[in-house]
Interface confidence: low
Amino acid sequence: HNTTVFQGVEGQSLQVSCPYDSMKHWGRRKAWCRQLGEKGPCQRVVSTHNLWLLSFLRRRNGSTAITDDTLGGTLTITLRNLQPHDAGFYQCQSLHGSEADTLRKVLVEVLADPLDHRDAGDLWVPGESESFEDAHVEHSISRSLLEGEIPFPPTS
């Protein structure tokens, strides 16, 4: 498996998608795990619903959520309020019995927010927001491993 890089900005959210063959993995639950070391085990972070037919329901473990489109064949993981310690290697897995097939190897990169007010002189002022509520992000930037990218201007 090649490694796919997903980049997010610190404090924001990152959506990771793992496509798979829906027929080959029919009836299988999925999981998102974090690779511990180069050859270490992959530690489970969150898995889809215990009932495969309900895999479309979002399941959450802390700031990480998972949902599975079993018909379309896309596993989606959302990492909210991304922090530097979230950076690292992960896997999307398809579970069968005590075994797990790797659907995709993922490298999560966490980029400092270049629009941080400390870097922008007097640019930033308190904004006006008329309501503050939680929501799920639906955005990420995915490229090949060789392309390091920063999704916001640095205002250096």
């Epitope: 404090g11 927001s129 201007p153 640095p154």
Partner: antibody, heavy 118, light 112 residues
Framework: EVQLVESGGGLVQPGGSLRLSCAAS????????MSWVRQAPGKGLEWVSV??????????GYNPSVKGRFTISRDNSKNTLYLQMNSLRAEDTAVYYC?????????WGQGTLVTVSS | DIVMTQTPLSLPVTPGEPASISCQSS???????????LNWYLQKPGQSPQLLIY???TRASGVPDRFSGSGSGTDFTLKISRVEAEDVGVYYC?????????FGQGTKVEIK
């Protein structure tokens, strides 16, 4: 599908005020920076203002040409971005676009025309 | 403010032929990260602008591969390998390095 729809433009006298709205859909509004960009008739594009996302406390930034006169805000319960424009001048006459800001202005609304004239 | 200067301001093109637009910035847009904060937009007649290229050379989602961006810290080029009728409109470069963000004055591409 991401959609941005502006409204609120119109004719206003110099020194007057106007409030523009931008209704957003198709993405999680609170997670994105949003911006206003304007285009005077027959002219080029000028960035006006930006408001950051929830993770950045919705802090705002302005082009010096409008700072102190314009205020950007957002109502996250309505997925709506606003631009309150005060002390309007003839040179503020333009089509005002609302745009989502990621690694560029990746989605734009259709624009709303603001005409400042006596 | 960083000043963006585009040339030419008008570009008559022939469908099927290549076309090239230049953009120059008054300051290097190359950041210490190695990224160059230069974007290209196309505004088709009667439409809103659309993002074509970001970080100088990365095509935005859905943009045909006949569009390519290149350049150095201050000199940039947008190339269309084979112009199609739907490519007409005004092309803008924009620096994304510093506030306030600034755009070039635009290059109007039209069919000969």
């Amino acid at each position: 599908e991401v959609q941005l729809v502006e409204s609120g433009g119109g004719l206003v006298q110099p020194g007057g005020s106007l409030r523009l709205s931008c209704a957003a859909s198709g993405f999680t509004f609170t997670d994105f920076y949003m911006s206003w960009v304007r285009q005077a008739p027959g002219k080029g594009l000028e960035w006006v203002s930006v408001i950051r996302n929830k993770a950045n406390a919705y802090t705002a930034g302005y082009n010096p040409s409008v700072k102190g006169r314009f205020t950007i805000s957002r109502d996250n319960s309505k997925n709506t971005l606003y631009l309150q424009m005060n002390s309007l001048r003839a040179e503020d006459t333009a089509v005002y676009y609302c745009a989502r800001l990621t690694y560029g202005f990746d989605y734009w609304g259709q624009g709303t025309l603001v005409t400042v004239s006596s | 403010d960083i000043v963006m200067t585009q040339t030419p301001l008008s570009l008559p093109v022939t469908p099927g032929e290549p076309a090239s637009i230049s953009c120059q910035s008054s300051k290097s847009l190359l950041h210490s990260t190695g990224k160059t904060y230069l974007n290209w937009y196309l505004q088709k007649p009667g439409q809103s602008p659309q993002l074509l290229i970001y970080w100088m050379s990365t095509r935005a989602s859905g943009v045909p591969d006949r569009f390519s961006g290149s350049g150095s810290g201050t000199d940039f080029t947008l190339k269309i390998s084979r112009v199609e009728a739907e490519d007409v409109g005004v092309y803008y470069c924009q620096q994304f390095l510093e506030y306030p963000f600034t755009f070039g004055q635009g290059t109007k591409v039209e069919i000969k």
